[in-house]
């Protein structure tokens, strides 16, 4: 028998420095977690102790903090090289800065293979990107070889900016021939490493003949066997065992997100490459694990540029950006409108001639807007200003919801109106009218939404049974501020870009902004 140790990360999202327990900015260092310096300590410890070790990443290193905003992927290549990753799968966020923003900083600089079997380049891009990412890679591990096949969410064109010269195929259809090829080349230990979410990971384990292990990402799934060490609630045991259609037991793993855990899976193979046993657990990278001094020193060196960046002007406002709780928790506020407009703008994807865009709606809890920006400072807006408005380090995500769920959300928005509570919704692509004289749960008297399948966008009444795409903060997607109906009833959830980054990009693009209060939210019967 031969034993392999798979160390894995996924959805690190730019958390190069240690973070607080909730993966936001580290405040009290003695209680902080993760970060590449701490990760390196643990990886090196395992590499020294065990003979056959692979360090893998299942995608979405890009996007999430000011590190990515400033360094645009160069930081990913640099620190992943320093940690000596063995392979990485492409995630949807690796395309956030377009194909060029993937090729130059990461694909050309990485000293490890970057994989995806279901992304096919066409046209002029095919020759430019040839060999820079691969469908599979065979790696020598100790005295054996291990094949690694990559995959990426086929929803990437709706979630990021891969352009028109990359085709995202069905994962299972694309993976099978690559695995078959590895088999003909006498590779009998095969890992599928990819970024399509836990449900697809399980399908791959079930359907792709010859895959021995699946290491996934995208859904930020936390799996654990036994008592979990922090706040994350396990979605199942680690590893999650899937019985394949041909009767094999295939371990499936994922390691939550944000570099908080290091996935640790031990697999025992027989001489023919069959999995005999698999066990392990994610390792919580808490402060009991010291940060590696040389990596930490490198992080501190790279940090300097970030501090300079945060005070530079992104653009100007010629109006007061009202982000006060007195406005945003009670009525339409122009800071809410600005943020929602930025959220929609960040999700412009012309993927179908029938649609002007795939999504037109935004909702945003007023309690998430934490500060106004005064235009009387020469109109200057900096990253620092935006960090005061959006201090929680969240993301603006894409969900699919039924109209009936949206109606419930808007009822919840005003169910206890007047108490300055955070659930009051700011909107984009939505016209809502409330009648506060009616009882809670029955206060939405009009709810019109902007069409997407139209050449001239206009507002139509919400249909209860229709499925709508909506951009919203991850906080809401996870049921925050009492929006349990969103969490419970959402039909799909894809994590998006860092909130501050979305707004800063929009302001930089517009150069001068002047958001107004324009009647997106109205109150009827003169009760307000």
């Amino acid at each position: 028998a031969w034993e392999l140790t798979i160390l894995h990360t996924n959805d690190v999202h730019s958390r190069l420095e240690q973070t607080s327990e909730d993966s936001s900015k580290c405040v009290n260092a003695s209680r902080c977690m993760g970060g590449v310096a701490r990760l390196f300590t643990k990886v090196q410890q395992i590499r020294r102790a065990e003979p056959n070790v692979l360090l893998l990443d299942a995608g979405d290193q890009y996007q999430g903090t000011i590190w990515f905003t400033v360094y645009k992927g160069a930081e990913v290549a640099h620190f992943m090289n320093a940690l000596r990753y063995d392979a990485m799968a492409l995630g949807n966020h690796e395309f956030d800065n377009g194909v060029e923003g993937l090729i130059e900083p990461l694909l050309k600089e990485a000293k490890f293979p970057i994989l995806s079997a279901n992304i096919k380049a066409k046209g002029p891009l095919a020759s430019q990107i040839s060999g820079l990412y691969l469908p599979y890679k065979v790696l020598p591990v100790g005295d054996e070889v291990v094949g690694i096949v990559g995959y990426t969410s086929k929803e990437t064109p709706f979630l990021s900016n891969p352009g028109t010269n990359l085709v995202f195929e069905d994962e299972i259809t694309a993976l099978q021939p690559e695995v078959d090829k590895l088999k003909t080349l006498n590779v009998n230990k095969i890992i599928a490493l990819g970024h399509s979410g836990f449900e697809m990971d399980k399908l791959i384990a079930q359907k792709v003949r010859g895959v021995d292990v699946v290491v996934g990402g995208h859904s930020n799934t936390f799996l654990y066997t036994g008592n979990p060490p922090s706040k994350e609630v396990p979605a199942g045991k680690y590893p999650f065992i899937v019985t394949s259609d041909d009767g094999r037991k295939v371990p499936v793993v994922q390691a939550y997100a944000f570099g908080k855990y290091l996935g640790y899976l031990k697999i025992e193979f027989d001489e023919r490459g069959n999995v005999i046993s698999s066990h392990g657990n994610p390792i919580l990278l808490n402060s009991s694990i010291p940060e590696d001094p040389s990596i930490k020193a490198d992080i501190n060196k790279w940090r300097i540029k970030l501090d300079n960046y945060s005070t530079q002007e992104l653009g100007k406002t010629i109006v007061y950006l009202d982000g006060s709780s007195q406005s945003c928790r009670f009525r339409e506020c122009n800071m809410g409108n600005l943020i929602c407009d930025a959220m929609i703008n960040n999700n412009l994807r012309h993927t179908d001639e029938m649609f002007w865009n795939h999504v037109s709606m935004c909702i945003l809890n007023g309690g998430g807007i934490r500060s106004p920006i005064d235009e009387r400072n020469n109109g200057t807006i900096t990253w620092e200003n935006l960090a005061a408005v959006l201090p929680f380090g969240g993301t603006f995500d894409l969900v699919q919801l039924k109209g009936s769920t949206l109606k419930k959300a808007f009822e919840h928005s005003v169910h206890r109106y007047g108490q300055s509570t955070g659930e009051f919704l700011q909107v984009g692509g939505i016209h809502v009218v409330y009648d506060l004289s009616r009882k809670p749960g029955d206060r939405v008297v009009k709810l019109d939404v902007l069409c997407t399948k139209c050449r001239v966008p206009s507002y139509d009444p919400l249909k209860m049974d229709e499925v709508y795409k909506v951009i919203l903060p991850n906080f809401l997607a996870n049921g925050g501020d009492g929006f349990q109906m969103i969490k419970d009833e959402l039909l799909r959830h894809d994590s998006g870009d860092q909130d501050i980054n979305v707004v800063s990009t929009y302001i930089s693009k517009m150069k001068v902004i002047y958001p107004a209060v324009e009647g997106r939210i109205k109150f009827s019967t003169g009760s307000h």
Epitope: P113, K137, V138, P140, D143, V145, N186
Partner: antibody, heavy 119, light 107 residues
Framework: QVQLVESGGGVAQPGRSLSLSCAAS????????MHWVRQAPGKGLEWVAL????????YYADSVKGRFSISRDNSKNTLYLQMNSLRAEDTAVYYC????????????WGQGTLVTVSS | EIVLTQSPATLSLSPGERATLSCRAS??????LAWYQQKPGQAPRLLIY???NRATGIPARFSGSGSGTDFTLTISSLEPEDFAVYYC?????????FGPGTKVDIK
């Protein structure tokens, strides 16, 4: 059928350099690791170097490490051996060999090219 | 580095006889042991890989056995074309070594 044809052998002075090539045909070159193996006149076989199917890993015998460099051009179906700081003991027939299965078998051999290091 | 020792250095036999060639490793080589045949003026030819698997086109009279440190190549009934030098070869951590060879000549 698989064919491996070595070239570039000849006479070189000690301390000088020589470059060997191997043209491969009859199989998908980019799918296979490739080796150089040598045989001094009247002696046994000595493994020299291995290069991974895509050129990403290289392995060398201690006797040539730091002096010889194995490389490949998959677009040209060609394997190379750059030999620097040649010594008299490098005199041998150099065989280009296909790795049939991840180092467990060296399944196809060229006819070899003779390298003579002499002053 | 793993050292391979082959015995005997020379084996003198007649056609039709059984040949038993031995290869011993200085430490365990798992299953990664192969056997090659070389005739004068020719390149070596793969006979056996992974200790006991016959290569494509190799006659059934050639067989390999053993594991760990002791391996054997058996030619059940020598044919005239089998008189040659036989080398064993191992791989450990991607470093390859050959044995010194056993010469099988006609008695």
């Amino acid at each position: 059928q698989v064919q491996l044809v070595e070239s570039g052998g000849g006479v070189a002075q000690p301390g000088r350099s020589l470059s060997l090539s191997c043209a491969a045909s009859g199989f998908t070159f980019s799918d296979y690791g490739m080796h150089w193996v040598r045989q001094a006149p009247g002696k046994g076989l000595e493994w020299v170097a291995l290069i991974w199917y895509d050129g990403s890993f290289e392995y060398y015998a201690d006797s040539v490490k730091g002096r010889f460099s194995i490389s490949r051009d998959n677009s040209k179906n060609t394997l190379y051996l750059q030999m620097n700081s040649l010594r008299a003991e490098d005199t041998a027939v150099y065989y280009c060999v296909r790795d049939g299965q991840w180092g467990s078998r060296l399944d196809y051999w060229g006819q070899g090219t003779l390298v003579t290091v002499s002053s | 580095e793993i050292v391979l020792t082959q015995s005997p250095a020379t084996l003198s036999l007649s056609p039709g006889e059984r040949a038993t060639l031995s290869c011993r490793a200085s430490q365990s080589v798992s299953r990664y042991l192969a056997w090659y045949q070389q005739k004068p003026g020719q390149a070596p030819r793969l006979l056996i890989y992974d200790a006991s698997n016959r290569a494509t086109g190799i006659p059934a009279r050639f067989s390999g056995s053993g594991s760990g440190t002791d391996f054997t190549l058996t030619i059940s009934s020598l044919e005239p074309e089998d008189f040659a030098v036989y080398y064993c070869q191992q791989r450990s951590n991607w470093i390859f070594t050959f044995g010194p060879g056993t010469k099988v000549d006609i008695k």
